[in-house]
């Protein structure tokens, strides 16, 4: 069996396939590593673009698993970051493996808004609740620089009625339509028997990245009556 002492100066292999995945602004770094006779440990460092005198900052040190949550090291999710990973076996270290540039807001996924639908007099009211990452609650784990431009600029709302689809846009900057909890959309209803099915997605500021699409919610109007 080969011991650590037998490893030459460049014989500690470099990690491979360093990738970053992010859901709800919670970025995690993954990498691959070949099977070694001795258990390797890994150090993960992060560098943020746009930070004055930006340096490589330790995110995970001497870990044995092949992933590292770097959410505490994201200053502004709109800005780019880079990650590098090195392996250590015994006293010897590998070269660094570097990730591609990654911006959490641009390259990550954001969960969907939640919808509620109801009939009020001669219209259907649609409540669009902002994705959980943007509102306070149990799911809010991420903290970031308040000057970020990572927020929802518009909602695309898709309304299907008896087979045909209409798309509405809600601008979140309009105070009449939106606050920091939800947006509202009112749709006039015809007196005919109709089923309305609604889904929505958010569009983020700057890059125009869309959130995941919400589940479709439906309501059936029978003349003046209602079934959910």
């Amino acid at each position: 069996e080969m011991g650590t002492a037998d490893l030459g100066p460049s014989s500690v292999p470099t990690p491979t396939n360093v990738t970053i995945e992010s859901y709800n602004m919670n970025p995690i770094v993954y990498w691959e590593y070949q099977i070694m006779p001795q258990v390797p440990v890994f150090t993960v460092e992060v560098k943020n673009y746009g930070v004055k005198n930006s340096e490589w900052i330790d995110a995970c040190i001497n870990i044995s698993h092949h992933y590292c949550n770097i959410s505490d090291h994201v200053g502004d999710p709109s800005n780019s970051l880079w990650v590098r990973v090195k392996a250590r076996v015994g006293q010897k270290e590998s070269a660094y493996a570097k990730s591609e540039e990654f911006a959490v807001c641009r390259d990550g996924k954001i969960g969907p808004p939640k919808l509620d639908i109801r009939k009020e007099e001669k219209q259907i009211m649609i409540d669009i609740f902002h994705p959980s990452v943007f509102v306070n609650g149990d799911e809010q784990e991420v903290d970031y620089d308040p000057e970020t431009t990572c927020y929802i600029r518009v909602y695309n709302v898709y309304v299907r009625m008896n087979g045909s689809e209409i798309q509405y846009k809600i601008l979140t900057q309009k105070e009449d339509d939106c606050d920091e909890i939800q947006c509202q959309l009112a749709i006039p209803v015809s007196s005919l028997n109709s089923q309305y099915c609604v889904s929505a997605e958010g569009v983020l500021h700057v890059w125009g990245v869309t959130t995941e699409k919400s589940k479709e919610v439906c309501i059936t109007i029978f003349n003046s009556s209602i079934k959910g």
């Epitope: 306070n136 809010q140 927020y151 929802i152 979140t172």
Partner: nanobody, 119 residues
Framework: QVQLQQFGGGLVQAGGSLRLSCTAS??????????MGWYRQAPGKQRERVAS???????YYSDSVKGRFAISRDTARNTVYLQMNSLEPEETAVYYC???????????WGQGTLVTVSS
């Protein structure tokens, strides 16, 4: 609609201290949904961020005020404070309170308050 009402400011000698406060009101206002910040604008210069506090309570400072200024908030009173120590004459400016919506990025501003630091 969010309203921000600022208090404090005035004339202070170089090396002195001053505390600004900013009270937010509005039916939907909650610190959990807004980032709060203090900005300043000196004559003939651009408005710059001095300090901010995120919806979760993390604080951010410009390099020039680190160690001298402190931002804090009182959630019961919907009030954010800026404690300014060791003030310098070049920090004479109009100081503005800001609330930025966490989801929409919508900005609200206080009326501004003049801080004059004499040498």
């Amino acid at each position: 609609q969010v309203q921000l009402q600022q208090f404090g400011g005035g004339l202070v000698q170089a090396g002195g201290s001053l505390r600004l406060s900013c009270t937010a009101s509005g039916s939907t206002f909650s610190f959990s949904n807004y980032h709060m910040g203090w900005y300043r604008q000196a004559p003939g210069k651009q408005r710059e961020r001095v300090a901010s506090i995120s919806s979760r309570g993390s604080t951010y400072y410009s390099d020039s005020v680190k160690g001298r200024f402190a931002i804090s908030r009182d959630t019961a009173r919907n009030t954010v404070y800026l404690q300014m120590n060791s003030l310098e004459p070049e920090e004479t400016a109009v100081y503005y309170c800001n609330a930025r919506g966490r989801a929409t990025g919508r900005d609200y501003w206080g009326q501004g308050t003049l801080v004059t630091v004499s040498s």
